[in-house]
């Protein structure tokens, strides 16, 4: 899977879209999870309604919402009041029994609010590395990782 980058401004809302084949994933609930480390598990943040027919209903977990257009094949996640700690690697998933298929890998970047003159030192941007290869560009305040970028901040 390529990783698509979605950029949002701190304090504002960011909408992430994950297109999928609605016929292939018929009847399947979806989920949004956060990747813990480069090879770690993906921790569930929020999932769609327990009844697939009601997947269009927005479900919230804290400041994160999820809604699914099951016929059109688009899963939409909204991150409200985006904060620096929201930056990182996520996945859109299609759930099937105990399995989860990855629909899209998403890197969320948090940009400093241009109107906020406080120290932006705690905002994280991906650093340079030669290890990350999957890259393609897709805009809507989003892009894909450039070759050489890594989805996790370097650890000291």
């Amino acid at each position: 899977h390529n990783t698509t980058v979605f950029q949002g401004v701190a304090g504002q809302s960011l909408q992430v879209s994950c297109p999928y084949d609605s016929m292939k994933h018929w009847g399947r609930r979806k989920a949004w999870c956060r990747q813990l480390g480069e090879k770690g598990p993906c921790q569930r943040v929020v999932s769609t309604h327990n009844l697939w027919l009601l997947s269009f209903l927005r479900r919230w977990n804290g400041s994160t919402a999820i809604t699914d257009d099951t016929l059109g094949g688009t899963l939409t996640i909204t991150l409200r009041n985006l904060q620096p700690h929201d930056a990182g690697l996520y996945q859109c998933q299609s759930l099937h029994g105990s399995e989860a298929d990855t629909l899209r890998k998403v890197l969320v970047e948090v940009l400093a609010d241009p109107l906020d003159h406080r120290d932006a030192g705690d905002l994280w941007f991906p650093g340079e590395s030669e290890s990350f290869e999957d890259a393609h560009v897709e805009h809507s305040i989003s892009r894909s990782l450039l070759e050489g970028e890594i989805p996790f901040p370097p650890t000291s």
């Epitope: 084949d21 016929m23 292939k24 009847g27 399947r28 697939w52 027919l53 099937h96 029994g97 399995e99």
Partner: antibody, heavy 122, light 107 residues
Framework: EVQLVQSGAEVKKPGESLKISCKGS????????IGWVRQMPGKGLEWMGI????????RYSPSFQGQVTISADKSISTAYLQWSSLKASDTAMYYC???????????????WGQGTMVTVSS | EIVLTQSPATLSLSPGERATLSCRAS??????LAWYQQKPGQAPRLLIY???NRATGIPARFSGSGSGTDFTLTISSLEPEDFAVYYC?????????FGGGTKVEIK
């Protein structure tokens, strides 16, 4: 008419390879999962695996993983089940079936092929 | 994988009698269960999906019930053409396993 038509009966020797087919018609072949089911003589149904012809995503039952290969050619609306080295224990009737979608979100094998009898004997 | 156990293995009944077939799952499959009928020399035919919904063209004498781990297929009054083997199958998770089957034979 929506249907799945399978290739004819096969008689093979142990160690030989084989590829049987299942051709779909009357519906959008790329938009439905196609499964394969084994039925050994006088026995029950065994779910072997499934393929989504739209992108060739394939899942196998652990019992059949590595024993068979499921593939599809969407340009001719055909799914395949193949063996690289047959064994006498592969003697069985093999069915392909379409995984139909239900309004509730569930799925079920709603259209079945007529079956392909494979006999492996020295 | 989810194991489906069908009982009884064989059911000997007369035409007009009521048939009750059971299918038990090793773990919950919610209502993601289907029933199929297979007659000798024929491919299986879908009877019931979603545990209780009749497939297109299936007579009303066939009904399904249950959810979670215990399911039942009932044939209210057996017709001569109903004597066959019946299989349950779960589509809750891969692999979509089948039960071992119940043969409904003429007494």
């Amino acid at each position: 008419e929506v249907q799945l038509v399978q290739s004819g009966a096969e008689v093979k020797k142990p160690g030989e390879s084989l590829k049987i087919s299942c051709k779909g018609s009357g519906y959008s072949f790329t938009s439905y999962w196609i499964g394969w089911v084994r039925q050994m003589p006088g026995k029950g149904l065994e779910w072997m695996g499934i393929i989504y012809p739209g992108d060739s995503d394939t899942r196998y039952s652990p019992s059949f993983q590595g024993q068979v290969t499921i593939s599809a050619d969407k340009s001719i609306s055909t799914a395949y089940l193949q063996w690289s080295s047959l064994k006498a224990s592969d003697t069985a009737m093999y069915y392909c079936a379409r995984l139909g979608r239900k309004p509730s979100g569930s799925v079920a094998f709603d259209i079945w092929g007529q079956g392909t009898m494979v006999t492996v004997s020295s | 994988e989810i194991v489906l156990t069908q009982s009884p293995a064989t059911l000997s009944l007369s035409p007009g009698e009521r048939a009750t077939l059971s299918c038990r799952a090793s773990q919950s499959v919610s209502s993601y269960l289907a029933w199929y009928q297979q007659k000798p020399g024929q491919a299986p035919r879908l009877l019931i999906y979603d545990a209780s919904n009749r497939a297109t063209g299936i007579p009303a004498r066939f009904s399904g019930s249950g959810s979670g781990t215990d399911f039942t297929l009932t044939i209210s009054s057996l017709e001569p053409e109903d004597f066959a083997v019946y299989y349950c199958q779960q589509d809750y998770s891969w692999p979509y396993t089948f039960g071992g089957g119940t043969k409904v034979e003429i007494k």
